[in-house]
């Protein structure tokens, strides 16, 4: 029961996290104009991974996409890549974890298969969360660097009394959404990995040893450890007594649930 709950909760937390990562990636407010001493501004600038926007006091908002690929900073490209990798891994992880859920029965899928799928999805969620956190952190670092650089050049004299006020950018809402979402995906992944251990029982799987005696010929089949994972319970230790002698090939083998050739 606890395993099912842990797995289910891990799935839900990861689902929320990945939805958050997608939302953060699509959001325009990765960086917003720093208003420092002026909380009300006539022109407010904010930027996302895909476009930059300007909101005027009039209420008019204009967004322009970055219609260049080569002209964009390498860091921005790296952040985009990390977020997309995070989304793709997360989406695959969600797909895998749906089939791995203990509460959902699909055909005659064994617990070990579900355990493996749970572990796989858990790892995917962890990597997805780390990608998102890394992407957001790289962008945040870029902002901090640019912020202090533009603060140093805050007012550039243009001769006489003319001044150019440089626009400084600070953390936008998308960064916080990304950090939280990445964290949730990471937590969900860890929960899936924990659930995986519970899904796979501890007993070592010993296969039955079959003796077939007929007169003096004894057919002995040591079938015990063929590709066994060591997880799962196979307590069907069957001894087969048959009056007739068999060749080794004729001796029945009872494969474990975990025999993968």
């Amino acid at each position: 029961m606890a395993v099912t709950a842990c797995q289910g909760l891990g799935f839900v937390v990861s689902l929320i996290g990945i939805a958050g990562i997608i939302a953060a990636t699509c959001m325009d407010q990765w960086s917003t104009q720093d208003l420092y001493n002026n909380p009300v501004t006539a022109v407010f600038n904010y930027q996302g991974l895909w476009r930059s926007c300007v909101r005027e006091s009039s209420g008019f908002t204009e967004c322009r996409g970055y219609f260049t690929l080569l002209g964009l900073p390498a860091m921005l490209q790296a952040v985009r890549a990390l977020m997309i990798v995070g989304i793709v891994l997360g989406a695959i992880g969600l797909l895998v974890s749906i089939f791995a859920l203990k509460c959902i029965r699909i055909g005659s899928m064994e617990d070990s298969a579900k355990a493996n799928m749970t572990l796989t999805s858990g790892i995917m969620f962890i990597v997805s969360g780390l990608c998102a956190i890394a992407g957001v952190s790289v962008f945040a670092n870029m902002l901090v660097t640019n912020f202090w650089m533009s603060t140093a050049n805050m007012y550039t004299g243009m001769g006489g009394m003319v001044q150019t006020v440089q626009t400084r950018y600070t953390f936008g809402a998308a960064l916080f959404v990304g950090w939280v979402a990445g964290g949730l995906t990471l937590i969900g992944g860890v929960m899936m990995c924990i659930a995986c251990r519970g899904l796979a029982p501890e007993e070592t799987n010993y296969k039955a040893v079959s003796y077939h005696a007929s007169g003096h010929s004894v057919a002995y089949k040591p079938g015990g450890f063929k590709a066994s994972t060591g997880f799962g319970s196979n307590t069907k230790n069957k001894k087969i007594y048959d009056g007739g002698a068999r060749t080794e090939d004729e001796v029945q083998s009872y494969p474990s649930k975990h025999d993968y050739v």
Epitope: T41, V43, N45, E56, G59, T164, V165
Partner: antibody, heavy 118, light 113 residues
Framework: DVQLQESGPDLVKPSQSLSLTCTVT?????????WHWIRQFPGNKMEWMGY???????NYNPSLRSRISITRDTSKNQFFLQLNSVTTDDTATYYC???????????WGQGTSVTVSS | DIVMTQSPSSLTVTPGEKVTMTCKSS????????????LTWYQQRPGQPPKMLIY???TRESGVPDRFTGSGSGTDFTLTISSVQAEDLAVFYC?????????FGGGTKLEIK
């Protein structure tokens, strides 16, 4: 089309309060945009005074902040200017306007001339 | 506050002539976010409220004759009337639309001979 019309007293005594009304037709003041007051002094110099946002929030010119108040009556689709402790320097033509793209003012009332004199 | 300085303060021209008036701001009105200059030009005929001609420094308001052209960037802006008409007798103002408080230039009075 949006139309604005100012109304109020022509003459105000120094140290008193000046109260003006702007009646808007053709657009609801709660639907969008900022609704501004701008005044023009006798020498043609113009001064932006402040605005009320369609949500009800306000923003004023720092030079007037201590004595200005812009409010509204949504049921009558009107917004108001109150300027306290007036002096003869407040003698001007007062315009109500609505902002548009580029933070520009394409919509103006006809203006109301106010003289501050004892 | 951004100070707007207009020149000349007045000029007299004959109909059909080309007119240029300038507006300088104490700070740049250019916004890098959308590559636009936040400057507006108004025309005020005698006894009337101002009428907006140009916004974003060079975008003509609908219904404004194409003889009015706005140009410039940063701190230096120009309003050009390619062929002055008698009805152009007015005072022309520029406005800082970039930061609060919005400020206006002192105006350029256009008189017709």
């Amino acid at each position: 089309d949006v139309q604005l019309q100012e109304s109020g007293p022509d003459l105000v005594k120094p140290s008193q309060s000046l109260s003006l009304t702007c009646t808007v037709t053709g657009y609801s003041i709660t639907s969008g945009y900022n609704w501004h007051w701008i005044r023009q002094f006798p020498g043609n110099k113009m001064e932006w005074m402040g605005y009320i946002h369609y949500t009800g929030s306000t923003n004023y010119n720092p030079s007037l902040r201590s004595r200005i108040s812009i409010t509204r009556d949504t049921s009558k689709n009107q917004f108001f200017l109150q300027l306290n402790s007036v002096t003869t320097d407040d003698t001007a033509t007062y315009y109500c306007t609505r902002i548009y793209n580029g933070n520009s003012f394409p919509y103006w009332g006809q203006g109301t001339s106010v003289t501050v004199s004892s | 506050d951004i100070v707007m300085t207009q020149s000349p303060s007045s000029l007299t021209v004959t109909p059909g002539e080309k007119v240029t008036m300038t507006c300088k701001s104490s700070q740049s009105l250019f916004n890098s976010g959308n590559q636009k200059n936040y400057l507006t030009w108004y025309q005020q005929r005698p006894g009337q409220p101002p009428k907006m001609l140009i916004y974003w420094a060079s975008t003509r308001e609908s219904g404004v004759p194409d003889r009015f052209t706005g140009s410039g960037s940063g701190t230096d802006f120009t309003l050009t009337i390619s062929s002055v008409q008698a009805e152009d007798l007015a005072v022309f103002y520029c406005q800082n639309a970039y930061s609060f408080p919005y400020t206006f230039g002192g105006g350029t009075k256009l008189e017709i001979k």
